[in-house]
Interface confidence: medium
């Protein structure tokens, strides 16, 4: 709305940088062939690029990424009883970000 | 995969708490009747609850919220020239989070 301007602080742009985000660990990251198990923990923190750039035709993108393997529990339920196994999930952390020009493919004439 | 266990650190649950997120300021928050304008800044930071809880039937939810009005620029394009106006957008920040039981409606028998 255009009302109550006095109390409002000027909005500050969310700059393009890494922020902590929550990544849900889906079961198919661990085993696509079997659904009879649970994963713990169900979510972890990752570093991801987010925010806006000063220009319309640029986008906030990761300029440097790092793969980070983490161990999770794969809890298989066999005859109503759990069997705990370790599984490795590889997470992607963004280490650095940049405002990158969006390349729109030109129509072929 | 179940391989390369040695190099992987145990995964740590992303606890239920407030984290900084990026909120895109959409034009219809400012004016639903007119599309012939731009908003600056296009995105801002907000505090939001995210993460996982220790239990299956609970969800990470905001237990305390605060409305925060911010001033943005509404840039109208009139005859190819920009006209700058001020507008207020009210953002929602989460101040505190809790793991709340998911109430699943029981089927009526």
């Amino acid at each position: 709305s255009l009302g109550s301007l006095a109390a409002a602080e000027p909005a500050v742009i969310a700059e393009c940088k890494t922020r902590t985000e929550v990544f849900q660990i889906s079961r198919n990251l661990i085993d696509r062939t079997n659904a009879n198990f649970l994963v713990w923990p169900p979510c972890v923190e990752v570093q991801r690029c987010s925010g806006c750039c000063n220009n319309r035709n640029v986008q906030c993108r990761a300029s440097q990424v790092q793969m980070r393997p983490v161990q999770v529990r794969k809890i298989e339920i066999v005859r109503k009883k759990p069997i705990f196994k370790k599984a490795t999930v590889t997470l992607e952390d963004h280490l650095a970000c940049k405002c990158e020009t969006i390349v729109t493919p030109r129509p072929v004439t | 995969s179940l391989g390369s266990l040695a190099a992987a650190e145990p995964a740590v649950i992303a606890e239920c708490k407030t984290r900084t997120e990026v909120f895109q300021i959409s034009r219809n928050l400012i004016d639903r009747t007119n599309a012939n304008f731009l908003v600056w800044p296009p995105c801002v930071e907000v505090q939001r609850c995210s993460g996982c809880c220790n239990n299956r039937n609970v969800q990470c939810r905001a237990s305390q919220v605060q409305m925060r009005p911010v001033q943005v620029r509404k840039i109208e394009i009139v005859r190819k020239k920009p006209i700058f106006k001020k507008a207020t957008v009210t953002l929602e920040d989460h101040l505190a989070c809790k793991c709340e039981t998911i109430v699943t409606p029981r089927p009526v028998t």
Epitope: F84 | L5, P10, N54
Partner: antibody, heavy 120, light 107 residues
């Protein structure tokens, strides 16, 4: 204060029965799996039994299977261990302990224990 | 049934590093936890999921687990660390404890 308090221990004759209770306070009991662990005098720790947060999963050490029954009453924030056909080798301090997750995991909170003595 | 084997005793001079081992078949495939127990007291969790330290546990406590052996390491051992230490792993449907290791801090 987050705590577990066991009760119900005592002297019982071989073949007899006892029911141990564990009262939980200071946390949402219904969100946690629980276990009983025992320790014979001068010996090491021995896991006895486990129950999931909602009571749907229960399992037991081979040494007590068929004789002991674990249960819980989430409305009363209480864990139980019904011990039947007691033997001399069941003499131990019995601890109730909390798992941090609904499925189990480490034992992050322990009670102070209650002594069970099986002797004629 | 699955067994975890620990040395009955380990001695260390104050300020030195103590290492307590726990071995079991393919133990590296399971998450190992370590508990400290002082005389007349209930056990206390000092390491969980191989290498994680609960809040309130000093940084000198650390853990590792690979192959057939998990290790609890206490760096700069202090007199107050003298206690029994138990490893534990949840394997097929049961929580298994090692036999325990008595850590003596030499005076």
């Amino acid at each position: 204060e987050v705590q577990l308090v066991e009760s119900g221990g005592g002297l019982v004759q071989p073949g007899g029965s006892l029911r141990l209770s564990c009262a939980a306070s200071g946390f949402t009991f219904s969100s946690y799996a629980m276990s009983w662990v025992r320790q014979a005098p001068g010996k090491g720790l021995e896991w006895v039994s486990y129950i999931s947060d909602d009571g749907s999963l229960k399992y037991y050490a081979d040494s007590v299977k068929g004789r002991f029954t674990i249960s819980r009453d989430n409305s009363k924030n209480t864990l139980y261990l019904q011990m039947n056909s007691l033997r001399a080798e069941d003499t131990a301090v019995y601890y109730c302990a909390r798992h941090p997750y609904w499925y189990g995991g480490q034992l992050d909170l322990w009670g102070q224990g209650t002594l069970v003595t099986v002797s004629s | 049934s699955y067994e975890l084997t620990q040395p009955p005793s380990v001695s260390v001079a104050p300020g030195q590093t103590a290492r307590i081992s726990c071995s079991g078949d393919s133990l590296g495939s399971y998450f190992v936890h370590w508990y400290q127990q002082k005389p007349g007291q209930a056990p206390v969790l000092v390491i969980y999921d191989d290498s994680n330290r609960p809040s309130g546990i000093p940084e000198r406590f650390s853990g590792s687990n690979s192959g057939n052996t998990a290790t609890l390491t206490i760096s700069g051992t202090q007199a107050e660390d003298e206690a029994d230490y138990y490893c534990s792993a949840f394997t097929h449907n049961s929580d298994v404890f090692g036999g325990g290791t008595k850590l003596t801090v030499l005076q």
